[in-house]
């Protein structure tokens, strides 16, 4: 598992929408794989976490102020759709094929 | 400022390419305005910060199970350019008025 | 070694035409933006205008004491800048120079070419 | 369009004495947090060379004893201990805007 000292990855993450209060509109799936971002952006950032300019030289002031600044976060900077069947204002069970933003396709530090 | 404590904003940070060792290739200006994203997000997320699906989701988790999985993340989510003069391959001072996602515009909860 | 040489000036009755041309070599003419700049007998230097790059469409600007009547271009396979000067008045008599630089600053400079304008 | 303006036209100075020039724009020629400002050296005979740019740094080549300072609309060209080579024609310049416009120039010569 990512833990805070390994760099930034994709973790696994099952959601149960009754332990987040969806099961009341979302019909199915029971569950779903989520997906977490886990782990430190530390220096130097490497290619896979597709650093913004903006994160390296926050990266860089960290590594020169670390009280003052903080490091870049492990965050998704893509996210996959999933399919839900849910009800519809008239209570009809609906297909949603693509219920976009809900699972993480890739990590990135930001 | 915006401490652990306050919600997700966009906060001031002045970096001085010195610092960072950029100053070797950036001839001016000597610092910008990067700004950084600090504080919390915090469960219910508001709209100011732009939460995406999977960060409303990693939220409700959170409030569940908080040793298991973290908060969302508060990270720039928009970012603007600055201009600076440099030196090309020939040593020429030149101006790029475009070096993109240097300074953040806008920050959020991912 | 960076060479701007310009092409022979000479004497142009008023109201006549000249082109000029530089010849450039030991950098990347494309990547540059060319200019010309002028300097009359004993005095200051003037910019008379700049073509920029083909990523810019070759944009040209000029100074409002030339505007209409001289025209800048390039040629970068031939790593050449053309100055066309017509309705020339006896204001216009100086030194030419070629100027290759950045959109900040002149870098390279050739020895320029005196075009002198009198009756 | 912005007008340089030189002072002073004209300067003898010692060998090994400082020499000061002067430049003032009529409007800010700073942007971006950076000045749009450069000076050229003209010797008798020669084609202008870039000295200083963007107001204090120095051209390739360019030796120690000369240094840029200034910001906004003010601006100076310093020669630290003044040397026979040294004589010459020096230029500030602005490429904040287009027409790019010169100072008039200021002549430095040795006392």
């Known amino acids: 598992s990512a833990g805070a000292g390994s760099h930034c990855q994709k973790t696994s993450l099952r959601v149960n929408f009754e332990d987040i209060g969806w099961d009341s509109w979302i019909i199915a799936p029971k569950e779903y794989e989520a997906y977490e971002c886990k782990g430190g952006c530390f220096f130097p950032l490497a290619d896979d976490v597709t650093p913004t300019k903006h994160a390296i030289v926050q990266t860089l002031v960290h590594l020169k102020f670390p009280t003052k600044v903080g490091k870049a976060c492990c965050v998704p900077t893509k996210l996959s759709p999933i399919s839900v069947l849910y009800k519809d204002d008239m209570g009809v069970p609906t297909l949603k094929y693509h219920y976009e933003g809900m699972s993480v396709a890739e990590c990135g530090c930001r | 400022s915006a401490g652990a404590g306050s919600h997700c904003q966009k906060t001031s940070l002045r970096v001085n390419f010195e610092d960072i060792g950029w100053d070797s290739w950036i001839i001016a200006p000597k610092e910008y305005e990067a700004y950084e994203c600090k504080g919390g997000c915090f469960f219910p997320l508001a709209d100011d910060v732009t939460p995406t699906k999977h960060a409303i989701v990693q939220t409700l988790v959170h409030l569940k199970f908080p040793t298991k999985v973290g908060k969302a993340c508060c990270v720039p989510t928009k970012l603007s350019p600055i201009s600076v003069l440099y030196k090309d391959d020939m040593g020429v001072p030149t101006l790029k008025y475009h070096y993109e996602g240097m300074s953040v515009a806008e920050c959020g909860c991912r | 070694e960076v060479q701007l040489v310009e092409s022979r000036g000479g004497l142009v009755q008023p109201g006549g035409s000249m082109r000029l041309s530089c010849a450039a070599s030991?950098?990347?003419?494309?990547?540059?933006?060319m200019n010309w700049v002028r300097q009359a007998p004993g005095k200051g230097l003037e910019w008379v205008g700049h073509?920029?790059?083909?990523?810019?469409?070759?944009?040209?600007h000029y100074a409002e004491s030339v505007r209409g009547r001289f025209t800048i271009s390039r040629d970068d396979s031939k790593s050449s800048l053309y100055l066309q000067m017509n309705s020339l008045k006896t204001e216009d008599t100086a030194v030419y120079y070629c100027?290759?630089?950045?959109?900040?600053?002149?870098?390279?400079w050739g020895q320029g070419t005196l075009v002198t304008v009198s009756s | 369009d912005i007008v340089m303006t030189q002072s002073p036209d004209s300067l003898a100075v010692s060998l090994g004495e400082r020499a000061t020039i002067n430049c003032r724009a009529s409007?800010?020629?700073?942007?971006?947090?950076?000045?749009?400002m450069n000076w050229y050296q003209q010797k008798p005979g020669q084609p202008p060379k870039l000295l200083i740019y963007?107001?204090?740094n120095q051209g390739s080549g360019v030796p120690d004893r000369f240094s840029g300072s200034g910001s906004g609309t003010d601006f100076t060209l310093t020669i630290s201990s003044l040397q026979a080579e040294d004589v010459a024609v020096y230029y500030c310049?602005?490429?904040?805007?287009?027409?790019?416009?010169f100072g008039q120039g200021t002549k430095l010569e040795i006392k």
């Open positions: 100027a290759g630089g950045s959109n900040y600053v002149f870098a390279f």
């Open positions: 963007a107001a204090s």
């Open positions: 073509i920029r790059l083909k990523s810019d469409n070759y944009a040209t």
């Open positions: 030991g950098f990347t003419f494309s990547n540059y933006w």
């Open positions: 409007e800010s020629v700073d942007n971006y947090g950076i000045s749009f």
């Open positions: 310049q602005q490429s904040k805007e287009v027409p790019w416009t």
